[in-house]
Interface confidence: low
C-alpha cells in the first residue's frame, strides 16, 4: 500500500479542530506581481514581506511596492509602507537583513533617472522604524554586512567604486575605484579585485587582488594576474593566469593573502572553470572542469592546508561556469554529501559519500519501490536524486533535497528508482539515517519542509491547479494526515517556515484569481496543539550514526570517531521545542586506512582501501610548491583526512622536506606584493 495508507497508521486525535483554531489567513491588498519574504532575526517571529507590481504604461513602467510586517511568525501582517514613505523598493536587491540577531534591515529604493545617487531605508529595530538615507552613489549590488560588525557595510556602485560605511549606512566613503568584486573576510577585512585598463571584463586575468584590514585607510596588493577569487572556510583562493599562455591555476592562502601556495590541481584553459563546492575550516571540495563542453569535471578534496588534493570523484556533473551542479551537503549527518555524475552513455546518476569524499557509492534502492524503465535488471537498481540540474531542466521537481542540522539523519528529496535519473514524474523519498537507507514517502512531486527539529514534516502537492490541502506527518514521513486549510483553493507559490527548522509555524503562500483581479494570500498554520506536550526523556532513543554493522567494534566510525545521538522516537507525538539542542556522545576510533586519503601522486583503485602510486609518477620524485618554495614529499601514499580524529592503529609515514629551491611557476610570491595607505 502507499505510504501512510496502511493499518498501522494511527491518526492524530482531533487534529482538524486543533489546526482550524490555529490557521490564520491574511489577504494582501495587492495586485499580484512578485513577493519576497525575509525573516528578521532568529526566534523573533518578525517577518518582512515586500510585494511589487509593475504597471506597464505607454512611455514607461510604473512600479509600486508595499511592505508588510509580522511579529507573530506570519499570523498577522501590518502594512508599514508608510514607514518607507510609500517608496518603490528595488526587488533585485532584496531585503538586506543583518547578521545574527542585530535587527538590522536595509531596503534599496528605486530613484528617478537624473538623481545624484541612490536611496536606502535603514532599520536597526527589527523593522519597527526606518530612516531614509540618500546615497552619494548608485548601488550596483546589495549592501553587504561585515560578519563581525553589523554596523560596517560595503557596496559596489554602478561606476565600479567600492563604498564603505562604518555607521550602518548613515555615512558612506568611496575607498577605491575600478573595483570588480568585493567580499568581507574575517576580522572586518575586505578583499577586492581591481582593473587597470578598461573594465572588469577586459582585464579578466589581469586583475589585481587587494586587501584592506582597516576599512580603507591602508591597502595591500596581495595578488596580480588574477582571474577571480573566492573565500571558503579559512581558505582564500585565487585563480591566476600563467605567464606563458592562457591557462590559469588555483593558488591558496591561509593567512589572508600574505603568503600563497599553488594548489596541486590541474590548470584550466579559457573555457574551463574551477568551483569551490564546499569548504569548512578543515578542507575544501574543489570541482575542476574538463576541457571542452563536456558538462562534467572532477571533484578533488584538499588536505588541511588546501594545497595537496586527492581525486575524489570523476565525471562530476557541472554544466558550465555558473551553471548547475547537484552537489549537496547533507547537513543532518556529518561527512555526507550527495551529487550527480554523467556516465559514459550520457545518463545521470546520483552518488553519495559518507566520509567527506573518501569514497562514493550509489544510493541504496528503497525497500518499497520498484526499478523503473531505466533499469537493465528489474531487481537491481539505485535511487537517483533530483536536485539543481533537474530543476534547471524544467523537470517536474519543485524542490531541491532538504536536510537540517537539528533534524538528525533526515534527508528528503525527489527521486527516481532505476539505473539513472528518469525524466518521468518523480516521487518524494526520505532517509532517516543520513542517506544510508531510503523509503518512498509521497507519490508524485511535492513541496516539503521540516518543523520542530523533525517532529513534524509538512508537504503540499505540486500542481498547476489551485490547492487547499496540506499534508503533515509526526513520524518522519511514515504516516500522513491531510488538512483542508481553506474552502477556496489558491494557486500555491511557496511554503515558508523560519530558517533553522525549530518553528512549529508554516506559511502557505499563494494567490487567488477572480475574473478581474488576483491577490496575494497567506495561510499560517501553527502545529503547537498537534504536538500537545513537551518531549520527555522516554520519548528519545539512542541512535548510532553511520552504523552499518553492529557486530563490528568499529561500527559507526567515520572520520576517526563515532557519534551516538538521542533521537525522537517515531511513535512519540510531542514538542522538541524551540530550545531543543541535539544531544550527541562522540567516541574516538582507532586509525585504519579508511582514515587516510591518498597522498599527492597516489590513487585508490575501485573497491580497495590501499593507495597505489599513479603509473605516470612511478619512480619520479614527488615535489610540489609551498609558499613559493619547492618541497620534497616522502610518503607511502597516505595522508590523514582533514578533520579526522582517529588515534592509534595504522600510522603511515609522511614527511615533507624543504628543498630550499624557488618554484619556477607563476606565484603570488611576497615580492610581487606591495602596500599603500590612503
Amino acid at each position: 500500500s502507499a505510504p501512510g495508507e496502511d493499518e498501522e497508521c494511527g491518526r492524530v486525535r482531533d487534529f482538524v479542530a486543533k489546526l482550524a483554531n490555529n490557521t490564520h489567513q491574511h489577504v494582501f491588498d495587492d495586485l499580484r506581481g512578485s513577493v519576497s519574504l525575509s525573516w528578521v532575526g532568529d526566534s523573533t517571529g518578525v517577518i518582512l514581506v515586500l510585494t511589487t507590481f509593475h504597471v506597464p504604461l505607454v512611455i514607461m513602467t510604473f512600479g509600486q511596492s508595499k511592505l508588510y510586517r509580522s511579529e507573530d511568525y506570519g499570523k498577522n501582517f501590518k502594512d508599514i509602507t508608510d514607514l518607507i514613505n510609500n517608496t518603490f523598493i528595488r526587488t533585485e536587491f532584496g531585503m538586506a537583513i543583518g547578521p545574527e540577531n542585530s535587527g538590522k534591515v536595509v531596503l534599496t529604493a528605486e530613484v528617478s533617472g537624473g538623481s545624484r545617487g541612490g536611496r536606502i531605508f535603514r532599520s536597526s529595530d527589527f523593522a519597527k522604524n526606518f530612516v531614509q538615507t540618500d546615497l552619494p552613489f548608485h548601488p550596483l549590488t546589495q549592501m553587504m554586512y561585515s560578519p563581525q560588525n553589523s554596523d560596517y557595510l560595503l557596496a559596489l556602485s554602478t561606476e565600479n567604486g567600492l563604498w564603505v560605511s562604518k555607521n550602518f549606512g548613515g555615512k558612506w566613503e568611496e575607498i577605491h575605484k575600478a573595483v570588480c568584486l568585493a567580499k568581507w573576510g574575517s576580522d572586518n577585512t575586505i578583499f577586492f579585485t581591481t582593473y587597470a585598463n578598461g573594465s572588469c571584463k577586459a582585464d579578466l586575468g589581469a586583475l589585481e587582488l587587494w586587501r584592506t584590514s582597516d576599512l580603507g585607510k591602508s591597502f595591500k596588493t596581495i595578488g596580480v594576474k588574477i582571474y577571480s577569487f573566492g573565500l571558503g572556510g579559512r581558505f582564500l583562493f585565487a585563480s591566476v593566469m600563467a605567464d606563458k599562455d592562457t591557462t590559469r591555476r588555483i593558488h591558496v592562502s591561509t593567512d589572508q593573502g600574505d603568503t600563497w601556495s599553488m594548489a596541486q590541481l590541474p590548470s584550466v584553459g579559457q573555457e574551463q572553470f574551477y568551483s569551490i563546492l564546499a569548504a569548512n575550516d578543515d578542507m575544501v571540495f574543489m570541482h575542476v572542469d574538463e576541457p571542452g563542453d563536456t558538462g562534467f569535471g572532477t571533484i578533488f578534496t584538499s588536505d588541511d592546508r588546501g594545497i595537496v588534493y586527492s581525486k575524489s570523484l570523476d565525471r562530476h556533473l557541472y554544466t558550465t561556469t555558473g551553471g548547475e551542479t547537484d552537489f549537496t551537503n547533507v547537513t543532518s549527518l556529518r561527512g555526507v554529501y550527495i551529487t550527480s555524475v554523467l556516465s559514459e552513455d550520457n545518463s545521470i546518476q546520483t552518488m553519495i559519500t559518507f566520509d567527506q569524499g573518501g569514497r562514493w557509492t550509489h544510493l541504496r534502492k528503497p525497500e518499497n519501490s520498484e526499478c523503473d524503465a531505466t533499469a537493465k535488471n528489474k531487481n537491481e537498481c539505485s535511487l537517483h536524486i533530483h536536485a539543481s540540474y533537474s530543476i534547471s531542466q524544467k523537470l517536474n521537481v519543485p524542490m531541491a533535497p532538504l536536510s537540517e542540522p537539528n533534524a538528525v539523519g533526515i534527508v528528503i528529496a525527489h527521486g527516481s528508482v532505476g539505473d539513472a535519473i528518469s525524466v518521468m514524474v518523480p516521487d518524494v523519498y526520505i532517509s532517516d539515517d543520513g542517506g544510508y537507507s531510503w523509503t518512498k514517502m509521497l507519490e508524485g512531486p511535492h513541496y516539503y519542509t521540516i518543523l520542530d527539529s523533525g517532529g513534524i514534516i509538512v508537504a503540499i502537492e505540486h500542481s498547476s491547479r489551485p490547492i487547499n490541502v496540506i499534508k503533515f506527518s509526526t513520524d518522519e514521513g511514515q504516516c500522513w494526515q491531510t488538512y483542508t486549510f481553506t474552502r477556496d483553493p489558491i494557486y500555491f507559490t511557496g511554503l515558508a517556515s523560519e530558517p533553522g527548522a525549530r518553528s512549529m509555524n508554516i506559511s502557505i503562500w499563494g494567490f487567488t484569481e477572480s475574473f478581474l483581479t488576483s491577490q496575494w494570500v497567506s495561510y499560517t498554520i501553527d502545529f503547537k496543539d498537534i504536538l500537545e506536550r513537551n518531549c520527555e526523556e522516554k520519548d528519545y532513543t539512542i541512535w548510532l550514526a553511520h552504523s552499518t554493522d553492529p557486530e563490528d567494534y568499529e561500527d559507526g566510525c567515520i572520520l576517526g570517531y563515532k557519534e551516538q545521538f538521542l533521537r525522537l522516537r517515531k511513535s512519540s507525538v510531542c514538542q522538541n521545542g524551540r530550545d531543543y539542542v541535539v544531544t550527541k556522545q562522540p567516541s574516538i576510533c582507532l586509525c585504519s586506512l579508511e582514515d587516510f586519503l591518498c597522498d599527492f601522486g597516489y590513487y585508490r583503485p575501485e573497491n580497495d582501501s590501499k593507495c597505489v602510486e599513479q603509473p605516470e609518477l612511478k619512480g619520479h620524485d614527488l615535489e610540489f610548491c609551498l609558499y613559493g618554495r619547492e618541497e620534497h614529499l616522502t610518503t607511502n601514499g597516505y595522508r590523514k583526512i582533514p578533520g579526522d580524529k582517529c588515534q592509534g592503529g595504522v600510522n603511515p609515514v609522511r614527511e615533507v622536506k624543504d628543498l630550499k629551491k624557488k618554484c619556477t611557476s607563476n606565484f603570488l610570491s611576497p615580492e610581487k606584493q606591495n602596500s599603500k595607505s590612503n
Epitope: G33, H54, P56, Q393, K394, M424, S464, Y491
Partner: antibody, heavy 129, light 107 residues
Framework: QVQLVQSGAEVKKPGASVKVSCKAS????????MSWVRQAPGQGLEWMGI????????SYAQKFQGRVTMTRDTSTSTVYMELSSLRSEDTAVYYC??????????????????????WGQGTTVTVSS | EIVMTQSPATLSVSPGERATLSCRAS??????LAWYQQKPGQAPRLLIY???TRATGIPARFSGSGSGTEFTLTISSLQSEDFAVYYC?????????FGGGTKVEIK
Amino acid sequence: QVQLVQSGAEVKKPGASVKVSCKASGYTFTSGYMSWVRQAPGQGLEWMGIINPYGGTTSYAQKFQGRVTMTRDTSTSTVYMELSSLRSEDTAVYYCARDPSGIAAAGPASRYYYGMDVWGQGTTVTVSS
Amino acid sequence: EIVMTQSPATLSVSPGERATLSCRASQSVSSNLAWYQQKPGQAPRLLIYGASTRATGIPARFSGSGSGTEFTLTISSLQSEDFAVYYCQQARLGPWTFGGGTKVEIK
C-alpha cells in the same frame, strides 16, 4: 495593449544567414521568456528555442543547436533570432511568442505553464538559389 | 524529446455540433500542456493552458481536460469561426514540442 511586431519578409541564398527581430510593447519586457517557433509551408509548428530577456540566457532545440542564436536588446525591448547556414528546408514563417512561464518570470506564474500567450505576426523567410 | 500525437488529423463536423480533439504525449507531461488555434495566414492563438484553463478572452465553448499523457480539447458547439487547425504543445521537458495538428473542417 501587449503586442509583438516582427521585421519584414526576407529572401536569402543557401548558406547565408538571416536575422529576424521582434519588438515587444505593452508589458515589462524582462518579465517573461520569448520563444521562437517556425512553420514550413503546409506544415505544423516547430519550436526552435527560448530566450530570457532579463538575463539573456537561452535554450535551443537540439535540431538548431550551433545554427541559431537568440539575443535581446533591453533598451529597445527587442529580441533577435539569427539562423545561419540556411538551406532550402529553412523556408518557413518564423514567429516570436511571449512565454510568460519562464523560470525568471516575476510572480507566481513562474511555477506553471501559461502557454505562449502573445504571438508576433510572423516573418516569411524564403531560401532559394 | 517528448513526441505529441494528435488525432484525428482531420475532423469533419457540422456547425452547432460538438468536436472532440485528442492529444497523446509519449511520456507524462503532467498538466504542462497548451492548445492553440490557427487560421490560414494568421499566427497561432492560445486557447487553453495548464491543460484545462481557458486563456483570456476565449469563449466558454472551448474546454480542455486530461493530465499525464492523454488530453482532450472539446468545442461544445462549433461556430463558423471555429473551423481552423488546432495544435497541442507540451512544456514539461525541453524542447517544447507540438502535435502535428488537427484540422477541423465543415461537414
